[in-house]
C-alpha cells in the first residue's frame, strides 16, 4: 500500500480520531517508507556481505545519489525552510529512477519494493502541495533516467548487489535528514 494503514480517507475504524494535519501525514508517510527500506535492507544484508563491505566508495563514485549538504538549508545550523523543501522534493524526484532499478532486485520482498516506490510518489505529491516555490524544483530528464537505468541493469552481479545496497542506504539517510528538517518546519 502506498499510504500507511489508517491514512486512507476511506478508513472509518476510528471515528473519534482527529484528521491528520498535512505535516503529520507527511511525517507518517516518511516513517512508513523508512520501515519499508528497513525490511529491504534486511533482505539485502542477509543475502550478501555488502553491508559490511569497505569497497562501497568505489561503487558510490558511479552513482549520483542525492545527498543533503549544509547549503541545502535542511540542517539545524543555517536552516532555511523554502530552500530545504525544494531540496527534499528535488532529491526525491532524483531518487525515483533508483527506486525503479530496485523493482526487480528482491525475491521475498518484491511487494515491499513496490510499496516503497509507490509511497515515495505519494510523498512527493504531499510535499508539492506544501511547497510555495514549485518553479525552483527541477524534474530529472526522462531520457537521461532511461539510459542510467539501462546502464545500472547492465552491471555485473557484484556491482548490482552493491548498487542495491548503496541506493537503500542513501535513500534511508536522505529520508532521515528530510524528516529531521520537516520536523523543524
Amino acid at each position: 500500500a502506498p499510504v500507511p494503514p489508517g491514512e486512507d480517507s476511506k478508513d472509518v475504524a476510528a471515528p473519534h480520531r482527529q484528521p491528520l494535519t498535512s505535516s503529520e501525514r507527511i511525517d507518517k508517510q516518511i516513517r512508513y517508507i523508512l520501515d519499508g527500506i528497513s525490511a529491504l535492507r534486511k533482505e539485502t544484508c542477509n543475502k550478501s556481505n555488502m553491508c559490511e563491505s569497505s569497497k562501497e566508495a568505489l561503487a558510490e563514485n558511479n552513482l549520483n545519489l542525492p545527498k543533503m549538504a549544509e547549503k541545502d538549508g535542511c540542517f539545524q545550523s543555517g536552516f532555511n525552510e523554502e530552500t530545504c523543501l525544494v531540496k527534499i522534493i528535488t532529491g526525491l524526484l532524483e531518487f525515483e529512477v533508483y527506486l525503479e532499478y530496485l523493482q526487480n532486485r528482491f525475491e521475498s520482498s518484491e511487494e515491499q519494493a513496490r510499496a516503497v516506490q509507490m509511497s515515495t510518489k505519494v510523498l512527493i505529491q504531499f510535499l508539492q502541495k506544501k511547497a510555495k516555490n514549485l518553479d525552483a524544483i527541477t524534474t530529472p530528464d526522462p531520457t537521461t533516467n532511461a539510459s542510467l537505468l539501462t546502464k545500472l541493469q547492465a552491471q555485473n552481479q557484484w556491482l548490482q548487489d552493491m548498487t542495491t545496497h548503496l541506493i537503500l542506504r542513501s535513500f534511508k539517510e536522505f529520508l532521515q535528514s528530510s524528516l529531521r528538517a520537516l520536523r523543524q518546519m
Partner: antibody
Framework: SVEESGGRLVTPGTPLTLTCTVS????????MSWVRQAPGKGLEWIGY?????STYYANWAKGRFTISKTSTTVDLKMTSLTTEDTATYFC???????????????WGPGTLVTVS | AYDMTQTPASVEVAMGGTVTIKCQAS??????LSWYQQKPGQPPKLLIY???TLASGVSSRFKGSGSGTEYTLTISGVECADAATYYC????????????FGGGTKVVVV
C-alpha cells in the same frame, strides 16, 4: 566498543576537547551522541552527529559545544567552561535497526571533567 | 520546545512487587520513546525502544506502553537487581530541545 578520553581538571574559561574512540563501528552508518551527567544528577543531552554529518545541539549547548567526527573518532569541543560543566561525559552510539528513532544502544564508560 | 517530564522522582517497591514510571512529553513524539536503566558508577543501558520493543537481552518483566504524549514503563516481579535510576528519552525531535531525557526515577527495592 566506545570509549571516551580527555576528561581532566581544568580552570574556568579553559577550552577542552573530549574524544570518543570507536572500534568495530562504521561511523558513516551510525548516529552518535554526547550526553553528560553532573555528580548526583540526571542525564543531560548535549547533541547528536548524524550519518549525514549534520549536528544538532541542545538549546543550552549551542555555540559553546561543537561535535565533529573522523572515520574512527567523535570529538566534543567545549569552550568557556564553568563550574556548572563539571560532569561525567558519555559518548553513545545510535542504533539503525529501525529506520528512524534516535535510541542509544551502546555507551562508553564516561570521562570525568572537573571545572574548578 | 520538546520537554520530557518523568514521575515519580523516586519510588520504593517491595521485592516481587510492581512499579510504574510515567513519562510525559510536551508534544506528541509518535511512539519514538526509549527507556534506560542506570546503576551507580555505570553508563546507562538501553531497555526499551520505540515505546514497547525490548532491547536485546532485557527481561520480559520490563514492559513499555503509551502513545502521543503519555508513556509508561512497568517493572513487574521486581528483583534486587532492578534497583537503579530509570530514564525516558524521546527520539522524535532534536531541534529546539533542552533535554531529550526525562529527569529520572530512582527505584529503591525494599
Amino acid at each position: 566498543s566506545v570509549e571516551e578520553s580527555g576528561g581532566r581538571l581544568v580552570t574556568p574559561g579553559t577550552p577542552l576537547t573530549l574524544t570518543c574512540t570507536v572500534s568495530g563501528i562504521d561511523l558513516s552508518s551510525y548516529d552518535m551522541s554526547w550526553v553528560r551527567q553532573a555528580p548526583g544528577k540526571g542525564l543531560e543531552w548535549i547533541g547528536y552527529i548524524y550519518t549525514d554529518s549534520s549536528t544538532y545541539y541542545a538549546n543550552w549547548a549551542k555555540g559553546r559545544f561543537t561535535i565533529s567526527k573522523t572515520s574512527t573518532t567523535v570529538d566534543l569541543k567545549m569552550t568557556s567552561l564553568t563550574t556548572e560543566d563539571t560532569a561525567t561525559y558519555f559518548c553513545a552510539k545510535g542504533s539503525t535497526d529501525y529506520a528512524f528513532d534516535t535510541r542509544l544502544d551502546l555507551w562508553g564508560p564516561g570521562t570525568l571533567v572537573t571545572v574548578s | 520546545a520538546y520537554d520530557m517530564t518523568q514521575t515519580p522522582a523516586s519510588v520504593e517497591v517491595a521485592m516481587g512487587g510492581t512499579v510504574t514510571i510515567k513519562c510525559q512529553a510536551s508534544q506528541s513524539i509518535s511512539n519514538e520513546l526509549s527507556w534506560y536503566q542506570q546503576k551507580p558508577g555505570q553508563p546507562p543501558k538501553l531497555l526499551i525502544y520505540r515505546t514497547s520493543t525490548l532491547a536485546s537481552g532485557v527481561s520480559s518483566r520490563f514492559k513499555g506502553s503509551g502513545s502521543g504524549t503519555e508513556y509508561t514503563l512497568t517493572i513487574s516481579g521486581v528483583e534486587c537487581a532492578d534497583a537503579a535510576t530509570y530514564y525516558c528519552q524521546q527520539g522524535y525531535n532534536s531541534n529546539d530541545v533542552d533535554n531529550v531525557f526525562g529527569g529520572g526515577t530512582k527505584v529503591v527495592v525494599v
